[in-house]
């Protein structure tokens, strides 16, 4: 699938600019193409690295340009290499001095195994010296000085693959830089044969195409295309699909084209000579002008295309009548396709005449793998090839090429495939809450591995050992209803991205168990302080109809420090628990439930303070109001948390002894007012108020002073003083 072309312009080096251009036509290499010196062919050449640049006129091309440098830097053998599926395709060529003593008849020569071969060099300088011929740098033959002919030849009566190599000729007094080079290519097989055992017949390659001994395909000369190289390109174009163009003012003049072995090098159609700068004489056409026109009806002979057939005629000599051939065209293939990884069935559709057959349609992956159709059908106007990729993966992303190669020509259409990784959640869904018949799930679709966008989500669930069910979900929080109590369930999430086969692999599985239908909480719950560090929780005895063992779970936590939480399991036959190791003067919350294998229902929350470790603070907001002649209303507030058990109101008449006071003890700390009664009218009292807890009494800072009102006049007929 790699169409690699090396243009050597020019192979004979003088003091003019010279170049090598390597083109990967219609092929998008993963690895860059390289141009280098071919030391295998010629050891003693310049060692300097080549200055390889991108050919800006083409997308996939590299170039080396020598601008009138000393010719010793240029003389030698070169290669262009492209790699596909780890295999290298290497094209070789050579450059030599125009002033060499001999010049080769051709830059390369391709022969079949067993051919009778003459490798020839033309003498261009006459010297009184022996002529010597080398193969791959080793001496093979010499001609005494008086016998050096005008055409120096190496004769191989029965060429074998081991005869292949670079042959060079020079006078004995010369050196590498006065040597002429030619490369002999010997096909592994005899003429018209290919295959590992050379027993398969080659397609007849027209127009000097060469049958590849490993594939049986024709390597077409520059200027021809198609399965048999019968189709001529438009003038000045080349490449397997004739898409490349010679940019020179005279087309492909002075371009020597080198193609993969066993083709070797030749001029483009219409040109000949070592420098490809001589036009074909009339009646000749093709690469190196080696083909002759024998047009049946005396049609015009074009040096680029051969016989120009009139309407209704075709064939190399216009000898066939019938419907004219039409170069295949690829139809309805988008430039870009986004594909989900997994099974993929790309389709190639082509028109043309004759209609392409199944064998003539291929699909080339970015790594160079060539796929043959799995299924094929055609209508009157189109051939449709369906290919199967059992498992397409992201590394398969890149430029794929649909290729159609018929006798009527060849066409390739590249298109970009972007293979997406199916999304998969990284985490299992989280079970937020469960009951005996429901579960609240956070499906945790983010983060996920793979490619978005996420089109939809499915939550799969099932009781263990049963089949999966799923629900389509939109939100992250989902409630599953109608579950079975006391059942093990499995959950996982599948993410779906757009496109066919967009369902990702389900993510990790979460297991959970639904609750049993639970018992009610203990009755008669009471929470009371026991000490500064303990509270006592009590409840009524528990009787259940179930035979399952049960226990009371008590959960307590501090209102101040929420983190201080503890769960205590209490055997079911007990009716109290001492919650100890608590902090003094701290309020705790407690709740309880009765659990079997299933968890019971929680009780309401109870709160209590542990006993204080300090004296209580004075009651606050002390007010004495509603004073009459013998009553007064005392009110106050107390601060929570000091285990205040009682409030003491102490009052005495002003001026009386300290011990003549009256104490009123209010044992219910929730009471916040008290009416003093039996006071004397028009009397001043000192009133103190204390809070009392397990440590002692508070210290009042000052006494309140009140004066009762005068007694009301007796209007009931008593004596009146005037």
């Amino acid at each position: 699938a790699m169409d690699l072309i090396l243009i050597n312009s020019l192979p004979l080096v003088s003091d003019a600019e010279t170049s090598l251009t390597c083109i990967a036509s219609g092929w998008h290499p993963h690895e860059p193409i390289t141009i280098g010196r071919d030391f295998e062919a010629l050891m003693n050449q310049h060692q300097d690295p080549l200055e390889v640049t991108q050919d800006v006129t083409r997308e996939w091309a590299k170039k080396v340009v020598w601008k009138r440098e000393k010719a010793s830097k240029i003389n030698g053998a070169y290669f262009c290499e492209g790699r596909v599926r780890g295999q290298a395709i290497r094209i070789r060529t050579m450059k030599m001095r125009q002033q060499a003593s001999f010049l080769p008849a051709t830059l390369t020569m391709t022969v079949d195994r067993g051919d009778n071969v003459n490798i020839s060099f033309k003498k261009v300088l006459i010297k009184e010296e022996d002529a010597v011929i080398y193969k791959n740098g080793s001496f093979i033959h010499s001609v005494p000085r008086h016998e050096v002919p005008d055409i120096l030849e190496v004769h191989l009566p029965h060429a074998q693959p081991q005869d292949a190599g670079v042959y060079s000729a020079r006078y004995i007094g010369g050196n590498l830089f006065t040597s002429a080079f030619t490369r002999l290519i010997v096909r592994r097989c005899e003429a018209q044969k290919w295959g590992p055992d050379c027993n398969r017949p080659c397609t007849t390659c027209k127009n000097n195409g060469v049958c590849h001994e490993d594939t049986g395909e024709c390597i077409c000369p520059p200027g021809f295309m198609g399965r048999t190289c019968e189709k001529a390109c438009e003038p000045h174009t080349f490449g397997r699909t004739c898409k490349e163009r010679c940019s020179g003012s005279e087309g492909c003049k002075s371009y020597v084209f080198c193609l993969p072995d066993p083709y070797g090098c030749s001029c483009a159609t219409g040109w000949r000579g070592l420098q490809c700068n001589e036009a074909c004489p009339y009646g000749h056409y093709g690469p190196d002008c080696k083909l002759r026109c024998h047009c049946t009806n005396e049609e015009m002979c074009d040096r680029f295309q051969g016989c120009l057939c009139s309407q209704g005629w075709q064939g190399l000599q216009c000898e066939k009548e019938g419907r004219p051939r039409m170069t295949p065209q690829i139809e309805d293939l988008p430039d870009h396709i986004e594909v989900n990884s997994g099974k993929f069935n790309p389709i190639c559709k082509a028109s043309g005449w004759p209609l392409p057959t199944s064998e003539e349609m291929t699909l080339v992956k970015p790594d160079g793998t060539v796929l043959q159709p799995n299924d094929f059908n055609h209508t009157d106007h189109f051939s449709v090839a369906i290919f199967t990729v059992n498992r397409i993966l992201p590394p398969d992303s890149g430029v794929w090429v649909c290729s159609v190669n018929t006798v009527a020509g060849m066409v390739e259409k590249p298109f970009n495939i972007s293979v997406k990784v199916l999304p998969e959640p990284l985490h299992a869904p989280n079970v937020i809450d469960t009951g005996h018949n429901f579960a609240i799930i956070n499906i945790s679709s983010e983060p996920y591995f793979g490619d978005g966008p996420i089109k939809s989500k499915k939550l799969f669930y099932k009781p263990v050992n049963q089949a999966w069910k799923y629900i389509q979900v939109m939100n992250e929080i989902v409630t599953l209803n109608y579950l079975e109590p006391r059942t093990d369930y499995e959950l996982c999430v599948q993410l779906v991205r757009p496109g066919e086969g967009g369902e990702g692999h389900p993510g990790p599985v979460r297991r959970f168990t639904t609750a049993s239908i639970g018992l009610p909480p203990p009755r008669g719950l009471s929470l009371l302080p026991k000490s500064q560090t303990a509270l006592n929780l009590t409840w009524q005895p528990i009787f259940t109809s179930s035979e399952d063992e049960f226990y009371v779970e008590v959960e307590r936590w501090s209102q101040q420090t929420r983190s201080d939480q503890q769960n205590i399991k209490v055997p079911g036959n007990l009716t109290s628990v001492l919650l100890n190791n608590l902090l003094p003067r701290e309020q705790y919350s407690v709740r309880a439930r009765v659990n079997t294998k299933a968890q019971g229902e929680w009780s309401e929350e109870l709160r209590a303070w542990t006993l204080s470790d300090i004296l209580p603070p004075q009651p606050e907001n002390i007010k004495i109001t509603n004073i009459t002649d013998y009553t007064a209303l005392v009110s106050w507030t107390i601060v929570d948390g000091y285990s205040i058990s009682s409030i003491i109101i102490r009052y005495k008449v002003q001026g009386k002894n300290e011990d003549q006071h009256i104490d009123v003890k209010i044992k219910n700390a929730t009471i916040t007012q008290y009416q003093l009664k039996g006071l004397e009218p028009e009397t001043t009292y000192h009133v103190d108020i204390f809070a009392e807890n397990n440590i002692g009494s508070s210290n009042p800072a000052f006494s309140q002073e009140i004066r009762t009102l005068p007694a009301p006049k007796d209007l009931g007929g008593g004596k009146m003083l005037l």
């Epitope: 310049h46 060692q47 010719a71 010793s72 001496f139 010499s142 010369g174 050196n175 830089f177």
Partner: antibody, heavy 122, light 112 residues
Framework: EVQLVESGGGLVQPGGSLRLSCAAS????????MHWVRQAPGKGLEWVAG????????VYADSVKGRFTISRDNSKNTLYLQMNSLRAEDTAVYYC???????????????WGQGTLVTVSS | DIQMTQSPSSLSASVGDRVTITCRSS???????????LDWYQQKPGKAPKLLIY???NRASGVPSRFSGSGSGTDFTLTISSVQPEDFATYYC?????????FGQGTKVEIK
């Protein structure tokens, strides 16, 4: 006109150093291997060192190995011989010579310079 | 190292004489192909040497045809078929089969 011109010779004390140069003209310098050959007064020729066209291959006579260094600058068309730790027996006329080959094989020296005299004496 | 021995070390000849100089090597100079890795040089007093013959028998460019080289293996000969006045000089053989390249000690051809 094809020619080689040596320079840099002279009188030097034993243990001293000297650098000889050979300027080439009239031919494509970097097409050929180059050599230094010396001749002690009244004696025969002795090959000293050779260097291939691209400096890829360099060889020395045992008598100078480790003391002399041959090099070339193709951009300047010049051959050099750096001579260190000179001894009295290094006294000679030093010729630079062009090979007909590009490598150090099948050598033949078809162009010679006029020579430069190096005298090592205290 | 390959030792090169020339004989005679000197000789006298008259103009027109045929002169033969012999060079013997301590090992064969014949390469795997048919060429011998031996060169002949001529040196005149106060001048640089001049290449006469390379690879045993190939005359260098501009060298008169009266000079010829022959021999193979270890025994080589330089022949001047008819010596001329300008040919009176010292002649050296040099082996190029392996480094170090080594010269013969020279043969001085003088006018009788």
């Amino acid at each position: 006109e094809v020619q080689l011109v040596e320079s840099g010779g002279g009188l030097v004390q034993p243990g001293g150093s000297l650098r000889l140069s050979c300027a080439a003209s009239g031919f494509t310098f970097d097409d050929y291997a180059m050599h230094w050959v010396r001749q002690a007064p009244g004696k025969g020729l002795e090959w000293v060192a050779g260097i291939s066209w691209n400096s890829g291959s360099i060889v020395y006579a045992d008598s100078v190995k480790g003391r002399f260094t041959i090099s070339r600058d193709n951009s300047k068309n010049t051959l050099y011989l750096q001579m260190n730790s000179l001894r009295a027996e290094d006294t000679a006329v030093y010729y630079c010579a062009k090979d007909i080959r590009e490598q150090l094989v099948e050598d033949a020296f078809d162009i010679w310079g006029q020579g430069t005299l190096v005298t090592v004496s205290s | 190292d390959i030792q090169m021995t020339q004989s005679p070390s000197s000789l006298s000849a008259s103009v027109g004489d045929r002169v033969t100089i012999t060079c013997r090597s301590s090992q064969s100079l014949l390469h795997s192909h048919r060429y011998n890795y031996l060169d002949w040089y001529q040196q005149k007093p106060g001048k640089a040497p001049k290449l006469l013959i390379y690879l045993g028998s190939n005359r260098a460019s501009g060298v008169p045809s009266r000079f010829s080289g022959s021999g193979s293996g270890t025994d080589f000969t330089l022949t001047i078929s008819s010596v001329q006045p300008e040919d009176f000089a010292t002649y050296y053989c040099m082996q190029t089969l392996q480094t170090p390249l080594t010269f013969g000690q020279g043969t001085k051809v003088e006018i009788k």
